[in-house]
């Protein structure tokens, strides 16, 4: 007789998830010098402790702790960059510059990326059927703790100067409800954090507007300057022309504003 | 430039108290998971006791009921209150420092000695 099995608003656990996780820790790891000292299979084995067993609305940060102090990685404070709605464009760009650092650059973020995960309270069972959703379920979901949680120690972590790619496309070109927005702006510490420069990503071909100017991007300004950070605002006009320049710097057509 | 000294060391008899004190400067010490680890020599360091930064507290099995780790935020500081002491915790006693992308840092260590 088929147990009965909760079903939750959002799509189910990714399918292999536990060796997509796996195999990510070992590129990774392979990869990069600094973090060939981690044992994968622990890694793996403290993500799974995070949410197997447990019920997937009554996840904590504490839960993920384990996994936290295993994928422990310096990062240049002061070459951190945040994003909000337009992650591709911010993972080219840090391709490019290596120098520079997304959240998904770091190991924990490259194990979790474009990943859904979840249990069942009480199986050892991982949910391929569905998991929940963070407004239809709950906000206490594997997957969104975990980002709540990594999205916090990676702000704290910010010094100097701290960009952010927003996405100008969108009607909220700044949304408080964002990772960015509720967790990583909050999280910037005044004592290391000097300023934080906003790089607003245009969409059309056309658009020659100021969105440094919009409403949402003042809003933020606002909650940035209460903190004691500065705020530094510039349009980004021509997002193909500007990792372009990244790449090639020298270029003539680099001198005039992108 | 980052500094854990570690403080409160010294000769205790078996059942007595020691108070072991650990002053950070040079980070945001409320930001960091700090830990308490102790060495004797030839074997590796051991987690005595850790505090989240959100303030959970994890003990080695061999210490609960008889450590209790604290922390003191404003005074950046972080404490190991030790009673019921026996000769099996004499070692010298590091003071950690963890944050996942902040970085990890270790006192320079103080000895306990437990002898009568």
């Known amino acids: 007789v088929p147990r009965w099995r909760q079903q939750w608003s959002g799509p189910g656990t990714t399918k292999r998830f536990p060796e997509t996780v796996l195999a990510r820790c070992v590129k990774y790891t392979e990869i990069h010098p600094e973090m060939r000292h981690v044992d994968c299979q622990s890694v793996w084995d403290a993500f799974k402790g995070a949410f197997i067993s447990k019920h997937p609305c009554n996840i904590t940060e504490e839960d993920y702790q384990p996994l936290m102090k295993l994928g422990t990685q310096t990062v240049p404070c002061n070459k951190i960059l945040l994003w909000s709605r337009i992650k591709d464009l911010a993972h080219q760009f840090t391709q490019v510059q290596r120098d520079m650092f997304t959240l998904e650059d770091t190991l924990l973020g490259y194990l979790a990326d474009d990943l859904t995960w979840c249990g069942e309270f009480n199986t050892s069972k991982i949910n391929y059927q569905s998991c929940p959703d963070w407004r239809k379920d709950c906000s206490n979901n594997p997957v969104s703790v975990f980002w709540k949680t990594v999205s916090r120690r990676f702000a704290e972590a910010a010094c100097d100067v701290v960009h952010v790619m927003l996405n100008g496309s969108r009607s909220k070109i700044f949304d408080k409800n964002s990772t960015f927005g509720s967790v990583e702006v909050h999280n910037l510490q005044p004592e290391k954090v000097q300023t934080l420069e906003a790089w607003v990503i245009h969409g059309g071909r056309e658009d020659s507007r100021d969105l440094c100017q919009d409403p949402t991007i003042k809003e933020l300004e606002s909650i940035i300057s209460k903190r004691n950070i500065q705020f530094s605002c510039k349009n980004i006009y021509r997002p193909d022309k500007f990792l372009q320049c990244v790449k090639n710097p020298e270029d003539s057509s680099c001198t005039s504003e992108i | 430039q980052v500094q854990l000294q570690e403080s409160g060391g010294g000769l205790v008899q078996p059942g007595g108290s020691l108070r072991l004190s650990c002053a950070a400067s040079?980070?945001?010490?409320?930001?960091?998971?700090m830990g308490w680890y102790r060495q004797t020599p030839g074997k590796q360091r051991e987690l005595v006791a850790e505090?989240?930064?959100?303030?959970?507290?994890n003990y080695a099995d061999s210490v609960k009921g008889r450590f209790t780790i604290s922390r003191d935020n404003a005074e950046n500081t972080v404490s190991l209150q030790m009673n019921s002491l026996k000769s099996g915790d004499t070692a010298v006693y590091y003071c950690?420092?963890?944050?996942?992308?902040?970085?990890?840092?270790w006192g320079q260590g103080t000895q306990v000695t437990v002898s009568s």
């Open positions: 505090i989240t930064s959100g303030g959970s507290t």
């Open positions: 950690n420092a963890d944050h996942t992308f902040a970085g990890v840092y």
């Open positions: 040079g980070i945001i010490l409320r930001l960091y998971d």
